[in-house]
């Protein structure tokens, strides 16, 4: 049994880190492999993650962690029974992928404006809470070429767009993702999309 692609891990900088790797051939990850992880600290326990399959040769493990701080470092050992396949380490603060924003809602009852709101995925005491910026993707359900990205670089998780910038009588979808500039993170996954109907009509004189 051989590791083809070594484990790479990302942290949500809160409580979960996700590690993925590829094996040299088809593998029943949960039956054959165990990923052991331990915070490098004198009295820390070694926890065991039972991986799950991620494609034919891919495996994925979710590591449950304490509230992450910048100096945290974990040792990782990938075992197949009593055989050590790979040994490595992981510093969560250096490989951050934020959680996806949630509760994306579209408010169309404000005249001439489409208001999008969503929730910051972190509690206020988390370091990432005040460091997130967002990208909002809006697209026309009937014309995928009619798609745009709005960058939200302020802290408030809201976006206002004039309804007139969208085609009238068309259904649109939106989704949002986040990243944290000061932590040099990757983008989060996109939030689930939400759909609305743009019923805005231009005033008669402008038609």
């Amino acid at each position: 049994m051989k590791v083809l692609q070594e484990p790479t891990c990302v942290s949500d900088y809160m409580s979960i880190s996700t590690c993925e790797w590829k094996m040299g051939g088809p593998t029943n990850c949960s039956a054959e492999l165990r990923l052991l992880y331990q915070l490098v600290f004198q009295s820390s326990e070694t926890h065991t993650c039972v991986p799950e399959n991620n494609g034919g040769v891919g495996c994925v493990c979710h590591l449950l962690m304490d509230d992450v701080v910048s100096m945290d470092n974990y040792t990782l050992d990938l075992w197949a029974g009593q055989q050590l396949l790979w040994k490595g380490s992981f510093k969560p603060s250096e490989h951050v992928k934020p959680r996806a924003p949630g509760n994306l809602t579209v408010h169309t009852n404000v005249s001439d404006t489409v208001l999008l709101t969503w929730s910051n995925p972190y509690p206020p005491d988390n370091y990432l809470y005040n460091d997130l910026t967002y990208a909002v993707n809006i697209w026309n359900e009937n014309d995928l070429a009619d798609s745009r990205i709005h960058n939200v670089t302020y802290l408030k998780p809201t976006l206002r767009i004039p309804a007139s910038t969208l085609k009238s009588g068309i259904s649109y979808r939106a989704r949002v993702r986040a990243w944290a500039q000061h932590y040099n993170t990757t983008w989060s996954e996109w939030s689930p999309s939400t759909k609305w109907y743009n019923s805005y009509r231009e005033p008669f004189e402008q038609r």
Partner: antibody, heavy 129, light 109 residues
């Protein structure tokens, strides 16, 4: 330094109740590990009672014999874990240890306690009339 | 799950090689730990995951086995090693943790 201190033991009559406390210091009781109770009757071996996951999920596991009479709970704000013991019998007389445990997880919702790494000094419970 | 530990007691001399065994009633992979306990004290973790030495434990202690059969070995018994030893098996099918009945190691003679 990480430490566990048990309290609440003492003499109780058969059929009575008692609540034991375990105060954690040097680490957060709400972090990623299990907190457990283990007991040892005088001159006898060790017997696992129950565990509670210290994170937000708070999932619990009990020894089959402990279900119903014993309840494990936690108060993260006080860094404390409790063991509520009801309908006590003479055979419940023992030193009760609090212990921190590692875990095995599959995904983020299936987590179960593994070995006990850090132990308190124990508190003696005597059930007698 | 049941854990059968043997022997229940043994007498040995300083410098002796001591072996204690533990058998699980079902396959527990490598989810086995060994503890040392002295009178009036809480147990002390020696080995976890069947063969991994806990922090600060002398290298004369070693563990082996997987599945159902496990062994704790003390390669050269020291005066401070006279104590009672327990195995602990963990079953993830039930989430239960079961201790062996213990092995008391006493001074020969």
């Amino acid at each position: 330094e990480s430490q566990l201190v048990e309290s609440g033991g003492g003499l109780v009559q058969p059929g009575g109740s008692l609540r034991l406390s375990c105060a954690a210091s040097g680490f957060s009781s709400s972090s990623a590990h299990y907190m457990c109770w283990v007991r040892q009757a005088p001159g006898k071996g060790l017997e696992w009672i129950a565990c509670i996951y210290a994170g937000s999920r708070g999932s619990t596991y009990y020894a089959s014999w402990a279900k119903g009479r014993f309840t494990i709970s936690k108060d993260n704000s006080k860094n404390t874990v409790y063991l509520q013991m009801n309908s006590l019998r003479a055979e419940d007389t023992a030193v009760y240890f609090c212990a921190r445990a590692a875990f095995v997880n599959r995904g983020v919702s299936w987590i179960w306690p593994y070995y006990f790494s850090l132990w308190g000094q124990g508190t003696l419970v005597t059930v007698s009339s | 799950i049941q854990m059968t530990q043997s022997p229940s007691s043994l007498s040995a001399s300083v410098g002796d090689r001591v072996t204690i065994t533990c058998q699980a009633s079902e396959d527990i992979e490598s989810y086995l730990a060994w503890y040392q306990q002295k009178p009036g004290k809480p147990p002390k973790l020696l080995i976890y995951r069947a063969s991994t030495l806990a922090y600060g434990v002398p290298s004369r202690f070693s563990g082996s086995g997987s599945g159902t059969d496990f062994t704790l070995t003390i390669s050269s018994l020291q005066p401070e090693d006279f104590a009672t030893y327990y195995c602990l098996g963990s079953s993830y099918s039930t989430g239960s943790n079961i201790f062996g009945t213990g092995t008391k190691v006493t001074v020969l003679g």
